[in-house]
C-alpha cells in the first residue's frame, strides 16, 4: 500500500519521514499519532496499538501537537501589578501583562518576569523618551525656554508663555507669569515640538496609557541600592 | 531574519539532470523541514516533497517518486533538490520553503529557481 | 489527492473594498486550510495557517473562516499593496495540494 493510506502505528519505509501530525516512536519502531493541542499522551503506541491521548487536566495545557505524558503546568496567577490577558487553557498558558503606567523589565519567553513601575519626571525635567512595554522613560532636563511643574511619565518640557511684559520670569519647573495684558505662546530654543494640549492643574495623577500587549508575569521590581536616575521620583 | 536563498537559473536539455540548492539562515536548520513546491508557467503550485535536515529522511509526492532526491548539507545549513530524467514540462520555478508537519504549511519561502527545459 | 479549487481564477475590487476569496476541497479537510498571497518578483508569503490562525507579522485586515470543505479568505479593507494572486492549500493530508489561485486585480 501507498504510504498515505497507511494507518497508524505503521513502520516506514527505510529512509522515509513519518506523515502530518505524526512522530516516530523509538520503541516501538512505528509512526504514531500525536496528540493535539489541548490533550496529551496517557498510553504510547506500541507495534499494534496506537497513540491513546486524554486530555488535559484543569490548569494545565498543551499548545503544540505533541505526545508528552503529562501536559504544561499554567503559570501562576497574575500578580497585582498585572492584568491577565489570555487565561488558562487546555491549549494555551496563561499571560499576563503589566498595567498601565508600568513596563516590563524582565522578559521571559513568554510574558514578563519583573514589572516595574514607570520612572516619574519631577519639576524641571520633562520626558524625553517616553516608556514602551518594554522599556522605561527617560527623562531630561528642561531645556531654557521650557518648563515642566508636573511629576509625570508621560508630560514633556513646554515652552515658556512670551510676556509683552514679564511679572515672574519662568524657569525649569514654572512657566513665566505676566502682567495683565494677553500673554502669547512662543516656541522657544529647545522646546520639544509636539502637540500638548495646555492644562490649567498639575497633572500629578497616574497616566493610563494604552494596556501593553507584551505578555508577562511580574514581580514588583525592588526600588534597590541604585538611586533614581535624574530627574525621576521613585514615588 | 528567517531567510531561504536559491541558486540561480538552469537551462537543461530533456533527459538531464538538474540540482538547485537552497541555503537556510536565521533559524536552527535541523529542526524544520524544508519542503519543495513547483510552478509551472502559468500554473498553480505542486508540492514535491519534504526532507527533514536532522537526518535526512524525505517524504514525497507520489509524482515524482524515483525521479527526485533531496540531500541536505547541515554544515552549511544548504538543501538540495535534484530533478532526473527531466521534460520539457517540468519547466517551472522551483521553491523551497519551510515548513510545518502539524498544520502543514509552509512559513519561509526562497525567491525561487527557474529551470527551463529545452532541445 | 485532495483537489483544491478556487471559486474565482479572477477578481476585480478597489482600495478600501471588503473582498472575499473561496475555495473549496474536493474532500472534508477539518480546519486544515492555509492561504498564501503571491506577488510578481516576490517570495511567497504565508498569511492564515489552520483555517484562521494569522501568521505573523500579517495585518489584521486578513482572516479565514470555513471548515470542512468551503473556505473563505476576507480582507476587509483593500489595500494597494494586498494586489496579487491568493493561493489555498490543504495541509490535511498527503499529498499537500493547491488551488489555482486568484488573482486580486484593481477595478
Known amino acids: 500500500l501507498p504510504a498515505q493510506v497507511a494507518f497508524t502505528p505503521y513502520a516506514p519505509e527505510p529512509g522515509s519521514t513519518c506523515r502530518l501530525r505524526e512522530y516516530y516512536d523509538q520503541t516501538a519502531q512505528m509512526c504514531c499519532s500525536k496528540c493535539s493541542p489541548g490533550q496529551h499522551a496517557k498510553v504510547f503506541c506500541t507495534k499494534t496499538s496506537d497513540t491513546v491521548c486524554d486530555s488535559c487536566e484543569d490548569s494545565t495545557y498543551t499548545q503544540l501537537w505533541n505526545w508528552v505524558p503529562e501536559c504544561l503546568s499554567c503559570g501562576s496567577r497574575c500578580s497585582s501589578d498585572q492584568v491577565e490577558t489570555q487565561a488558562c487553557t487546555r491549549e494555551q498558558n496563561r499571560i499576563c501583562t503589566c498595567r498601565p503606567g508600568w513596563y516590563c523589565a524582565l522578559s521571559k519567553q513568554e510574558g514578563c518576569r519583573l514589572c516595574a513601575p514607570l520612572r516619574k519626571c519631577r519639576p524641571g525635567f520633562g520626558v524625553a523618551r517616553p516608556g514602551t512595554e518594554t522599556s522605561d522613560v527617560v527623562c531630561k532636563p528642561c531645556a531654557p525656554g521650557t518648563f515642566s511643574n508636573t511629576t509625570s511619565s508621560t508630560d514633556i518640557c513646554r515652552p515658556h508663555q512670551i510676556c509683552n511684559v514679564v511679572a515672574i520670569p519662568g524657569n525649569a519647573s514654572m512657566d513665566a507669569v505676566c502682567t495683565s495684558t494677553s500673554p502669547t505662546r512662543s516656541m522657544a530654543p529647545g522646546a520639544v515640538h509636539l502637540p500638548q494640549p495646555v492644562s490649567t492643574r498639575s497633572q500629578h495623577t497616574q497616566p493610563t496609557p494604552e494596556p501593553s500587549t507584551a505578555p508577562s508575569t511580574s514581580f514588583l521590581l525592588p526600588m534597590g541600592p541604585s538611586p533614581p536616575a535624574e530627574g525621576s521620583t521613585g514615588d | 531574519q528567517v531567510q531561504l536563498v536559491q541558486s540561480g537559473a538552469e537551462v537543461k536539455k530533456p533527459g538531464a539532470s538538474v540540482k538547485v540548492s537552497c541555503k537556510a539562515s536565521?533559524?536552527?536548520?535541523?529542526?524544520?523541514?524544508i519542503n519543495w513546491v513547483r510552478q509551472a508557467p502559468g500554473q498553480g503550485l505542486e508540492w514535491i516533497g519534504w526532507?527533514?535536515?536532522?537526518?535526512?529522511?524525505?517524504q514525497f509526492n507520489e509524482n515524482f517518486k524515483g525521479r527526485v532526491t533531496m540531500t541536505t548539507d547541515t554544515s552549511t545549513s544548504t538543501a538540495y533538490m535534484e530533478l532526473r530524467s527531466l521534460r520539457s514540462d517540468d519547466t517551472a520555478v522551483y521553491y523551497c520553503?519551510?515548513?510545518?508537519?502539524?498544520?502543514?504549511?509552509?512559513?519561509?519561502w526562497g525567491q525561487g529557481t527557474t529551470v527551463t527545459v529545452s532541445s | 489527492d485532495i483537489q483544491m479549487t478556487p471559486s474565482t481564477s479572477s477578481l476585480s475590487a478597489s482600495v478600501g473594498d471588503r473582498v472575499t476569496i473561496t475555495c473549496r476541497a474536493s474532500?472534508?479537510?477539518?480546519?486544515?486550510l492555509n492561504w498564501y498571497q503571491q506577488k510578481p518578483g516576490k517570495a511567497v508569503k504565508l498569511l492564515i495557517y489552520?483555517?484562521?490562525k494569522l501568521h505573523s507579522g500579517v495585518p489584521s485586515r486578513f482572516s479565514g473562516s470555513g471548515s470542512g470543505t468551503d473556505f473563505t479568505l476576507t480582507i476587509s479593507s483593500l489595500q494597494p499593496e494586498d494586489f496579487a494572486t491568493y493561493y489555498c492549500?490543504?495541509?490535511?493530508?498527503?499529498?499537500?495540494?493547491f488551488g489555482g489561485g486568484t488573482k486580486l486585480e484593481l477595478k
Open positions: 536565521g533559524y536552527t536548520f535541523i529542526t524544520y523541514d
Open positions: 526532507i527533514y535536515p536532522r537526518d535526512g529522511n524525505t
Open positions: 474532500q472534508d479537510i477539518s480546519n486544515y
Open positions: 492549500q490543504q495541509g490535511n493530508t498527503l499529498p499537500l495540494t
Open positions: 489552520f483555517k484562521s
Open positions: 520553503a519551510r515548513g510545518d508537519r502539524d498544520y502543514g504549511y509552509f512559513d519561509v
